[in-house]
């Protein structure tokens, strides 16, 4: 499955939108920084077969979509930007779902992939727990926004590596 060029553009657009969503100066939130322990090895791409990498990407985008689809998220961000951001993620999910179905038919997805998906889920659980502990404060959301921008950047890099493998 060849991910369309539009998928990569969509990821870039999502990053730009997320960058525009900030409502307060991040300089006031330095002391709220938190180690979410991003599972960087899951974005490496070299250790994965293509089907595994696509599954990890799908999980990453799905969890991001879920995080920004909550009521608490709606209260935190400017509505029109949030809707555009969610639309970009939704389109990416559709692209990836088509690929997941296609690739899993070609390769048997090993158990290692389940571990990778679980690592991504646990990462998002840590993010959600942080927001709960910080009572969804503006600074907590600002820290999470920065973290998601970072993980989306990793996703973009993984997509680039996938395209080079084709």
């Amino acid at each position: 499955c060849d991910l369309p060029q539009t998928h990569s553009l969509g990821n870039r657009r999502a990053l730009i939108l997320l960058g525009q969503m900030g409502r307060i100066s991040p300089f006031s939130c330095l002391k709220d920084r938190h180690d979410f322990r991003i599972p960087q090895e899951e974005f490496d791409g070299n250790q994965f077969q293509k089907a595994q990498a696509i599954s990890v990407l799908h999980e990453m985008i799905q969890q991001t979509f879920n995080l920004f689809s909550t009521e608490d998220s709606s209260a935190a961000w400017e509505q029109s930007l949030l809707e555009k951001f969610s639309t970009e993620l939704y389109q990416q999910l559709n692209d990836l779902e088509a690929c997941v179905i296609q690739e899993v038919g070609v390769e048997e997805t090993p158990l290692m992939n389940e571990d990778s998906i679980l690592a991504v889920r646990k990462y998002f659980q840590r993010i959600t727990l942080y927001l709960i502990e910080r009572k969804y404060s503006p600074c907590a959301w600002e820290v999470v926004r920065a973290e998601i921008m970072r993980s989306l950047s990793f996703s973009t890099n993984l997509q680039k590596r996938l395209r080079r493998k084709d």
């Epitope: 991040p26 330095l30 709220d32 920084r33 950047s153």
Partner: antibody
Framework: EVQLVQSGAEVKKPGESLKISCKGS????????IGWVRQMPGKGLEWMGI????????AYSPSFQGQVTISADKSISTAYLQWSSLKASDTAMYYC??????????????WGQGTLVTVSS | DIQMTQSPSSLSASVGDRVTITCRAS??????LNWYQQKPGKAPKLLIY???SLQSGVPSRFSGSGSGTDFTLTISSLQPEDFATYYC?????????FGQGTKVEIK
């Protein structure tokens, strides 16, 4: 390879204006903040201020607020430090360094080579 | 502002010595403390971030510890290239502040 390359040494007279630069390469320039640090001859490090190049939001140390202006041009991945009226006491080495912003990552992990500013009549 | 106080301001040591530098913050900064090494005429170099994380490429003889207000940088076995000035810096809140530096000299 991540690099921060600063403009060359400057010799100025008191009262003159100056703008020094710091060009980033090898990474996404808008994903990191750029901080400026002063080191006067034989002295320690002093943090001056910082900029988020994605939107040019700035924060200054109270000691430097109103004395200098920090700016950035993300289209050319460059941050600037400027003075409108230099004083002899501004003679120092000035460093730029990148900062991960709100991400849990190493602070000031890459530094420019420094720009020596000499102000003398 | 958060004041950072380093001690000692200078020390003399021999190659192979274990060297300890301390840094005290005027208020709790959790673990938001970095250590830098600077050699004459050169830019500072990050050694330790978030109190105890070793920066990539830095030799394992360097280690950091502490949280709250009291922090330590330890060089387990001093090497000739370690003679330099060391600075702590808090990254807990703005304005960011550095310690005054500790110069490590050859005995």
């Amino acid at each position: 390879e991540v690099q921060l390359v600063q403009s060359g040494a400057e010799v100025k007279k008191p009262g003159e204006s100056l703008k020094i630069s710091c060009k980033g390469s090898g990474y996404s320039f808008t994903s990191y903040w750029i901080g400026w640090v002063r080191q006067m001859p034989g002295k320690g490090l002093e943090w001056m201020g910082i900029i988020d190049p994605s939107d040019s939001d700035t924060a200054y140390s109270p000691s430097f607020q109103g004395q200098v202006t920090i700016s950035a041009d993300k289209s050319i991945s460059t941050a600037y430090l400027q003075w409108s009226s230099l004083k002899a006491s501004d003679t120092a080495m000035y460093y730029c360094a990148r900062h991960p912003g709100l991400n849990w990552a190493p602070d000031f992990d890459y530094w420019g080579q420094g720009t020596l500013v000499t102000v003398s009549s | 502002d958060i004041q950072m106080t380093q001690s000692p301001s200078s020390l003399s040591a021999s190659v192979g010595d274990r060297v300890t530098i301390t840094c005290r913050a005027s208020q709790s900064i959790d673990r938001a403390l970095n250590w830098y090494q600077q050699k004459p005429g050169k830019a500072p170099k990050l050694l330790i971030y978030f109190a105890s994380s070793l920066q990539s490429g830095v030799p394992s003889r360097f280690s950091g510890s502490g949280s709250g207000t009291d922090f330590t940088l330890t060089i387990s076995s001093l090497q000739p290239e370690d003679f330099a000035t060391y600075y702590c810096q808090q990254s807990f809140d703005f304005p960011l502040t550095f310690g005054q530096g500790t110069k490590v000299e050859i005995k």
